[in-house]
Structures are given as structure tokens and as C-alpha cells.
């Protein structure tokens, strides 16, 4: 006759291990099931009753591993204004950032923006740097570039793109400032002279 | 009138430079950011480099970044493209172009184009 | 492969509408990026269409007109005329380059 297959959680015979995906729980003294990557026992097993699993919640990830599943959710590290996403977060790994490149810059705190380049600009009112986009002089106050950007009757910022720390000298008449608070994503930019 | 014209385009080997020029009239120089586009024989166009009216920020395309230096003389009327390291996928009709009054994303005057051949 | 997405042709007779999409992404026109369109005729130089989505340079006749919507937009040329014969590329500012990104084009052709 065929050994009878064990459900979890069941009482190992002496000398054998758990099978594949299962382990042994010291305070139950069963063979319990492990929880996938990237969830947690938000239940650990009994005498009567099997682990119960729960993946961490959206914007966290397993920071530590066991052989029941993950012990701990900890919240996705997020890049503060100048660093962007070098490498998503997973299920079991974290956020991991970089510093801008020159030419490219993030404004959010954030565990998904990435580095974006700065805006090209007729005449520059204001260097973009790793934090902030570059300001244009804006000779179209009407111009639609994109979602809330916002116009501003003087620059609001001296703060210097990598190497150029003044605005662009100009002839043309200069109405106003377009400041851009748009969508925060992707990366790879401009230089500066 | 508005005018670009380029020139200094050529044959060049694989590895070698190359020089463009582009010289605009009509229009006041210094208030626009300027453009190259390229287009491959029989194909689309790519935008390659941007510099803004004040020569103080230049823009790239990651295909040519760090082989291409984009520049300009605003007392000349003139724009550049160093071009080095040429490659046999560098081959393009190069054109300049006007960024567009209010908005630098689009090109509301461009040049008649020089060629660019890169062979061994 | 192209960032914009274009028919890589279209075509009608004289007379006729034709209309020619342009498709982006959510880090393009559905940013909330204008979508710019040019014109190249055979031998010749690119040549401003459309800009910011529905606005004709001074020149341009009214049959050519632009729309946009959501992640796509679209250029429509009534009255079709032999002279439209020529390539068409939309473009338009992207999130995550440094420069405006172009269609692959589309070939109008202008039958009979």
C-alpha cells in the first residue's frame, strides 16, 4: 500500500525531515508549510491548524527572511528630492537609490520616481540642478507643456544647474516664469557647459 | 525671412570627426534654443542635440552623448556640431532646427539638410 | 522601434479624408505633452504642420487639422490633394528623454 500523504500540519516521523516547501515549527512540533517569497506568517501554525500566509502590503517588502517565510514587512525606501529609483522594490527587496546625474533631476520623495531630465528651454530663467528642473523664460503665457505646470511672476529660486549658476541673457521679452510640476518619471539627460 | 543653412558634411571613416555648421538669419538668434535632427536613408527622423538661446545648458540624445558637442555663437548667428567617434550608424542627413516660440519642443523652421557618410 | 507610434502608410484618392494616428504612452502624450506634426515632401526638407496639437503656422491650408486625446492624437487632411503626397511624423515631448520623440512616419499616398 501507498504511505498515506500528510497534510500540514502533520507530526514528522523521528529521524525524517519536512518535505519541500514545509518546516518544522519548534513550538508546535509539526511540519508547517512555508509561506512563498515575498509573504509572511501572519498566523504561525498549531497543533490543529496550518501557517497563514499574507503578502506584505502594497509599498512594503519582506526585510527578513526565515525558513517559515518572511518575519518582517518593512516599509519600500523612498529617494528624497535629488535622488531617483536606480532599482525598483520587490516583493523581497528594497528600493535602492542614486544620486541625479547632471542634466536630470527629481523634486519627489518617492519609493517609484526615477531621475528625469530637465526641461529644454529657449532662454534658461533658472539652471535646473538634482533636485529642481531648469525655469524658462516664457515669452507664451497660454503655453499647455504639461499637467500643473505654473507660471510665476519671478523666479522663485537661485538655486544652480551642476556647472551654470546664472540665468541666460536674453533679448526677448520676458512675461513670465514656467515653473513645471508635472509627472515624476524616467531618466537620462541633458549636460551643462 | 527665416533661414538655416548647413554645411561641412562629407564622407568620413569610422572613427573619424566631423564638423557641422549652421548659420540662421531672420530671426533673433539668441532668444531660441536650437536643434539637430538626422534621418538614416529611407528612415525616420531622430532628434539628436539641443542647446538652449543662451548656450548655457546643452541637451543629447543617449545615442550620441559623449561623442557629440553641441555649441553655439550667438554673435556669429551660428550653431555646431562636433561630431567624433563617428560611427557607420551616424550616417544621416543632418538638419538644423528653430525651437518653436514658447515652446522648444517642436521645430517651426528647419534647414535644407547636409549629409553625413560614414564608410571605410 | 519608434517611442510614437504611426501607420507606417496611408492612402486615398483626391477629394478624400484621410486621417493619420499618432500613439504615445503615459510618459508622452498622455503626460499631457502637445503633439507637434510635420510634413516631408519627397527630396525635401521636414516642414511644421501642426503644433500644439491643433494649431496651423501661417501658410498651412485649413484642410490639414490636428486632434488629441488622451495617449493618441491624429492628423486629418480633407480635401485630399495630390500635393499632399509625402511623409508624415508626429512628435512629442517625453518624461523620460531629453528631446521631443518622433513617429516612424507615414507614407500618404495620394491614388489615381
Known amino acids: 500500500l501507498p504511505a498515506q500523504v500528510a497534510f500540514t500540519p502533520y507530526a514528522p516521523e523521528p529521524g525524517s525531515t519536512c518535505r519541500l516547501r514545509e518546516y518544522y515549527d519548534q513550538t508546535a512540533q509539526m511540519c508547517c508549510s512555508k509561506c512563498s517569497p515575498g509573504q509572511h506568517a501572519k498566523v504561525f501554525c498549531t497543533k490543529t491548524s496550518d501557517t497563514v500566509c499574507d503578502t506584505c502590503r502594497p509599498g512594503w517588502y519582506c526585510a527578513l527572511s526565515k525558513q517559515e517565510g518572511c518575519r518582517l514587512c518593512a516599509p519600500l525606501r523612498k529617494c528624497r528630492p535629488g535622488f531617483g529609483v536606480a532599482r525598483p522594490g520587490t516583493e523581497t527587496s528594497d528600493v535602492v537609490c542614486k544620486p541625479c546625474a547632471p542634466g536630470t533631476f527629481s523634486n519627489t520623495t518617492s519609493s517609484t520616481d526615477i531621475c528625469r531630465p530637465h526641461q529644454i528651454c529657449n532662454v534658461v530663467a533658472i539652471p535646473g540642478n538634482a533636485s529642481m528642473d531648469a525655469v524658462c523664460t516664457s515669452t507664451s503665457p497660454t503655453r499647455s507643456m504639461a499637467p500643473g505646470a505654473v507660471h510665476l511672476p519671478q523666479p522663485v529660486s537661485t538655486r544652480s544647474q551642476h556647472t551654470q549658476p546664472t540665468p541666460e541673457p536674453s533679448t526677448a521679452p520676458s512675461t513670465s516664469f514656467l515653473l513645471p510640476m508635472g509627472p515624476s518619471p524616467p531618466a537620462e539627460g541633458s549636460t551643462g557647459d | 525671412e527665416v533661414q538655416l543653412l548647413e554645411s561641412g558634411g562629407g564622407l568620413v571613416q569610422p572613427g573619424g570627426s566631423l564638423r557641422l555648421s549652421c548659420a540662421a538669419s531672420?530671426?533673433?538668434?539668441?532668444?531660441?534654443?536650437m536643434h539637430w535632427v538626422r534621418q538614416a536613408p529611407g528612415k525616420g527622423l531622430e532628434w539628436v542635440s539641443a542647446i538652449s538661446g543662451g548656450a548655457t545648458t546643452t541637451y543629447y540624445a543617449d545615442s550620441v552623448k559623449g561623442r557629440f558637442t553641441i555649441s553655439r555663437d550667438n554673435s556669429k548667428n551660428t550653431l555646431y556640431l562636433q561630431m567624433n567617434s563617428l560611427r557607420a550608424e551616424d550616417t544621416a542627413v543632418y538638419y538644423c532646427a528653430k525651437g518653436g516660440t514658447g515652446d522648444p519642443y517642436y521645430f517651426d523652421y528647419w534647414g535644407q539638410g547636409t549629409l553625413v557618410t560614414v564608410s571605410s | 522601434q519608434s517611442v510614437l507610434t504611426q501607420p507606417p502608410s496611408a492612402s486615398g484618392t483626391p477629394g478624400q479624408r484621410v486621417t493619420i494616428s499618432c500613439t504615445g504612452s503615459?510618459?508622452?502624450?498622455?503626460?499631457?505633452?502637445?503633439v507637434h506634426w510635420y510634413q516631408q515632401l519627397p527630396g525635401t526638407a521636414p516642414k511644421l504642420l501642426i503644433y500644439?496639437?491643433?494649431q496651423r503656422p501661417s501658410g498651412v491650408p485649413d484642410r490639414f487639422s490636428g486632434s488629441k486625446s488622451g495617449t493618441s492624437a491624429s492628423l486629418a487632411i480633407s480635401g485630399l490633394r495630390s500635393e499632399d503626397e509625402a511623409d508624415y511624423y508626429c512628435?512629442?515631448?517625453?518624461?523620460?528623454?531629453?528631446?521631443?520623440?518622433f513617429g516612424g512616419g507615414t507614407k500618404l499616398t495620394v491614388l489615381g
Open positions: 531672420g530671426f533673433t538668434f539668441s532668444s531660441y534654443a
Open positions: 503615459s510618459s508622452n502624450i498622455g503626460a499631457g505633452y502637445d
Open positions: 500644439r496639437n491643433n
Open positions: 512628435a512629442a515631448r517625453d518624461d523620460g528623454l531629453s528631446g521631443p520623440v
